[in-house]
């Protein structure tokens, strides 16, 4: 129905008031709901209304406005402060300490996060991003700087329908339609092999205590752990000579030791330096996280940054020790 | 199967010394923090040292600091806790525990050794 | 150093009841408190960590609950072989301190 100027929608009435002619919804049942378009944002609830704009917007805290848009800081929220002495003693002894596994402590001297002291250090969003890791979306942290909200903008929840069996299956050269999603990992790209290459700049260096034969032995399975992670693919980098890039790594009391060595080379019987780990350079291959999603890392940087929330939140499978994000091609260094 | 065995435990006199060993079998060793508890004789439980083999950082209860060296070796998948001025009130049978989480001191102890145990007598 | 403090320190039950053992930590440890039995010459078993979770093995029957100071262990239906020793422990801050035991008994 119609009133002058104003057009009103289906099941709407028109009704005269001082103000002029205004639209009126009798039963929001048979009304176009206003909630429809999702207006409330950073996950606000919608109500619909009688009146225009037809919804109005429950805002979660510390968001305002008609949809929720406006970010209200917290009135002089006090900085989080460390447990000062007894967290710098701890600090960067190789063994994270949860009473300092906090922002103000650097988590902890980055001993809870892959030796990584801020992930978050390029993220310029208002929200401390790294309190934000709750399971439900938050819109101003969903930037690749901000590590992807944690990937809780697009149902994280998700999880791998037949994984046991995609996880026997993964990236075997035999494509596996069941197992072809992100959420098990694309089959290890075993149905995109056709398809071209879609490499992020620089190389991930992992160290993970586990020496090489081993890692080897498990690749598929630790490559599919730490791709679910990052909800795209990775793989072993090749060198030169196409050999896979999986070093011995003797620690971090190796320099003292090999020094050691040194003077007592001669010796006879003298043992070889002990493998505590491997080396692993690692390359993200997008060519199906950009075919599904738009929260593709074009670089390492962001991906290594991730690993690092992980290992904060403690949700890492794998005993991983410090990640790297290398934007040149390494040499072989230990 | 993930195993820790105790060994070295025995009668000592006051101010003596005594080295205990923790052998672990049945995962990586280096990953994985060790501590030692202790229980005196109809008491309950007290930690007493803490070790990340892969580091080597160690932590230390103020009751036997000083006085008591936790030592790893990765060869050997041995933990060890030297006790040196040893008293009476170091009476105890001595636990060795892994801790369950990769890099975490944070983390719950999830397998225990048998124990062994300490007497400290003239 | 953080306190632990159980209660009771010894109680006495029958098969099939409802047992609950209290713990309170002096200061906030989060959720970072375990929760031990213990047999007569026998080293400890874990049963509970993160407060909540129970460990690899442990039947359904054992529950935790609580975080920040206050902690509950509860064994819903308990069974002959649940008669033992338990303690709960913080380890958020070290020193990590036990809970000095709570002792179920035959009734």
């Known amino acids: 129905s119609s009133c002058g100027q104003v057009k009103c929608r289906k099941g709407e009435q028109c009704v005269h008031t001082a103000s002029g002619p205004r639209c009126f919804c009798p039963s929001p049942r048979d009304c176009e709901s206003g909630c429809a378009s999702s207006p409330c944002q950073h996950g606000g609830s919608c109500h619909p209304q009688r009146q225009p704009p037809y919804y109005s917007c429950q805002c979660a805290p510390p968001f305002s406005g008609s949809r929720c848009e406006l970010y209200t800081a917290p009135p002089s929220t006090p900085p989080a402060t460390c447990l000062s002495q007894y967290c710098a003693d701890k600090a960067r002894d190789g063994v994270c300490d949860e009473a300092c596994n906090s922002h103000a402590c650097q988590w902890d001297g980055g001993d809870c996060s892959l030796t990584m002291e801020n992930p978050w250090a390029n993220c310029s969003s208002p929200l401390p991003c790294w309190d934000y890791i709750n399971n439900q979306c938050d819109e101003l942290c969903n930037t690749v700087e901000c590590l992807f909200d944690n990937f809780e903008c697009q149902g994280n929840s998700k999880t791998c329908k037949y994984d046991k069996y995609c996880a026997d299956h993964f990236k075997d050269n035999h494509c596996d339609q069941g197992c072809n999603s992100e959420e098990c990992g694309w089959d290890g790209l075993d149905c995109a092999a056709d398809q071209p290459e879609n490499l992020a700049e620089g190389t991930l260096v992992i160290v993970v205590l586990m020496p090489p034969e081993q890692l080897l032995q498990d690749a598929r399975s630790f490559l599919r752990a730490l791709g679910t992670l990052l909800h795209t693919n990775l793989r072993i980098k090749r060198d030169s000579q196409g050999e896979l890039m999986v070093y011995p790594y003797y620690g971090e009391k190796s320099a003292a030791m090999k020094k050691q060595r040194m003077t007592r080379r001669s010796l006879p019987g003298e043992q070889e330096q002990e493998v505590a780990g491997s080396k692993v350079f690692l390359e993200i291959d997008n060519r199906q996280c950009v075919q599904d999603s738009d929260h593709c890392f074009k670089n390492t940087d962001a991906a290594a940054a991730l690993l690092a929330s992980h290992a904060i939140q403690g949700t890492l499978s794998y005993p991983l020790v410090s990640v790297v994000s290398e934007s040149l091609t390494p040499e072989r260094t230990q | 199967e993930v195993q820790l065995v105790e060994s070295g435990g025995g009668l000592v006199q006051p101010g003596g010394s005594l080295r205990l060993s923790c052998a672990a079998s049945?995962?990586?060793?280096?990953?994985?923090?060790m501590s030692w508890v202790r229980q005196a004789p109809g008491k309950g439980l007290e930690w007493v040292s803490y070790?990340?083999?892969?580091?080597?950082?160690?932590y230390y209860a103020d009751s036997v600091k000083g006085r008591f060296t936790i030592s790893a070796d990765t060869s050997k998948n041995t933990a060890y806790l030297q006790m040196n001025s040893l008293r009476a009130e170091d009476t105890a049978v001595y636990y060795c525990a892994r801790h369950s989480g990769y890099y975490r001191i944070s983390s719950a102890m999830d397998v225990w050794g048998q124990g062994t145990l300490v007497t400290v007598s003239s | 150093d953080i306190q632990m403090t159980q209660s009771p320190s010894s109680l006495s039950a029958s098969v099939g009841d409802r047992v609950t053992i209290t713990c309170r930590a002096s200061q906030s440890v989060r959720s970072f408190l375990a929760w031990y039995q213990q047999k007569p010459g026998k080293a400890p078993k874990l049963l509970i960590y993160?407060?909540?979770i129970r460990a690899s093995g442990v039947p359904s029957r054992f529950s935790g609950s609580g975080s920040g100071t206050d902690f509950t262990l509860t064994i819903s239906s308990l069974q002959p072989e649940d008669f033992a020793t338990y303690y709960c422990?913080?380890?958020?801050?070290?020193?990590?301190?036990f809970g000095q035991g709570t002792k179920v008994e035959i009734k």
């Open positions: 070790i990340y083999p892969y580091s080597g950082a160690t």
């Open positions: 993160r407060a909540s």
């Open positions: 422990q913080q380890y958020y801050i070290s020193p990590w301190t």
């Open positions: 049945g995962y990586t060793f280096s990953s994985y923090g």
